[in-house]
Amino acid sequence: YDFTNCDFEKIKAAYLSTISKDLITYMSGTKSTEFNNTVSCSNRPHCLTEIQSLTFNPTAGCASLAKEMFAMKTKAALAIWCPGYSETQINATQAMKKRRKRKVTTNKCLEQVSQLQGLWRRFNRPLLKQQ
């Protein structure tokens, strides 16, 4: 999906009012310095591409993030504020349902959510120069 035509300000508002705290709660008990940010993004469409990938695509050591509350809210926000997103995701979801995993919090998942927090921070500050 091409995130270029999303309403970025509405997605930012959604993040600030309904998503960010759930990421913090997921990470509770973890030091903010525990993980280094290794995933970056250069602009808002790129950030959303990376956020979608980290949130919904199972990875080695962390297969379950898609069933977390913050992921559900992300899915809902993208569907509302990115034209055509819901249509493109319907087929992808049918495939995902066949491999729905039980929610398990692993260190790899914590690291992945830490990366997500960094991507969201970057998304919310699009005018900052890339480090």
Partner: antibody
């Protein structure tokens, strides 16, 4: 303007079935997570069920296995199929637009379901 | 699912400040929403994301959430504010929406 209109409520005997419908207008229905919330007479609000644009569903434990939520995005319509109805299912059933999965920003006017012999 | 606890009733004199509490385990780690419901009407969202007001909701409505308690505050309460108020959050395991039992606000 944004509107949700429920229909299909009525009197049904215990063990019976009923299908509620909700016609949505004024917004891109196919993009939103939609849900049903009920309110027994003189009681509080109880979330019943919700459904994503892609058909992914969630249910309250009290209705799991008896109620089925569905949607037809081409008709901008939300449904609630209620089977094996019990007296305790008697309530006003509200169709609701659930913003960002976690709260309700638009409510219908409600339709009354009475389960009684 | 988590349980949200509200006082059944709260009374306030016109022009005074009404505070309605909503208690739940580690509630401060989740977002809380508040709805106003008048007799025979559907609920109306008055606070979202702990403390934000939807457009059209008067400034006298405000919200806070920390620890195990969220609070809806109505400053300079008016007769038209008499209604039932429901807090709402969600369960992080089941992902279900959860409502408090409701509080009847009486403006004396």
């Amino acid at each position: 303007q944004v509107q949700l209109v429920e229909s299909g409520g009525g009197l049904v005997q215990p063990g019976g079935s009923l299908r509620l419908s909700c016609a949505a207008s004024g917004f891109t229905f196919s993009s939103y997570y939609m849900s049903w919330v009920r309110q027994a007479p003189g009681k509080g609000l109880e979330w019943v069920s919700g459904i994503f644009f892609d058909g992914e569903t969630y249910y309250a434990d009290s209705v799991k296995g008896r109620f089925t939520i569905s949607r037809d995005n081409s008709k901008n319509t939300l449904y609630l199929q209620m089977n094996s109805l019990r007296a305790e299912d008697t309530a006003v059933y509200y169709c609701a637009r659930q913003q960002y999965f976690d709260h309700i920003d638009i409510w219908g006017q409600g339709t009354l379901v009475t389960v009684s012999s | 699912d988590i349980e949200l606890t509200q006082p059944p009733s709260v009374s306030v004199a016109p022009g005074q400040t009404a505070r309605i509490s909503c208690g739940g385990d580690s509630l401060g780690g989740k977002y809380v929403y508040w709805y106003q419901q008048k007799p025979g009407q559907a609920p109306v969202l008055v606070i979202y994301g702990d403390s934000k007001r939807p457009s059209g909701i008067p400034e006298r409505f405000s919200g806070s959430n920390s620890g195990n308690t969220a609070t809806l505050t109505i400053s300079g309460t008016q007769a038209e504010d008499e209604a039932d108020y429901y807090c709402q959050s969600y369960d992080l395991k089941s992902l279900n929406v959860v409502f408090g039992g409701g509080t009847k606000l009486t403006v004396l």
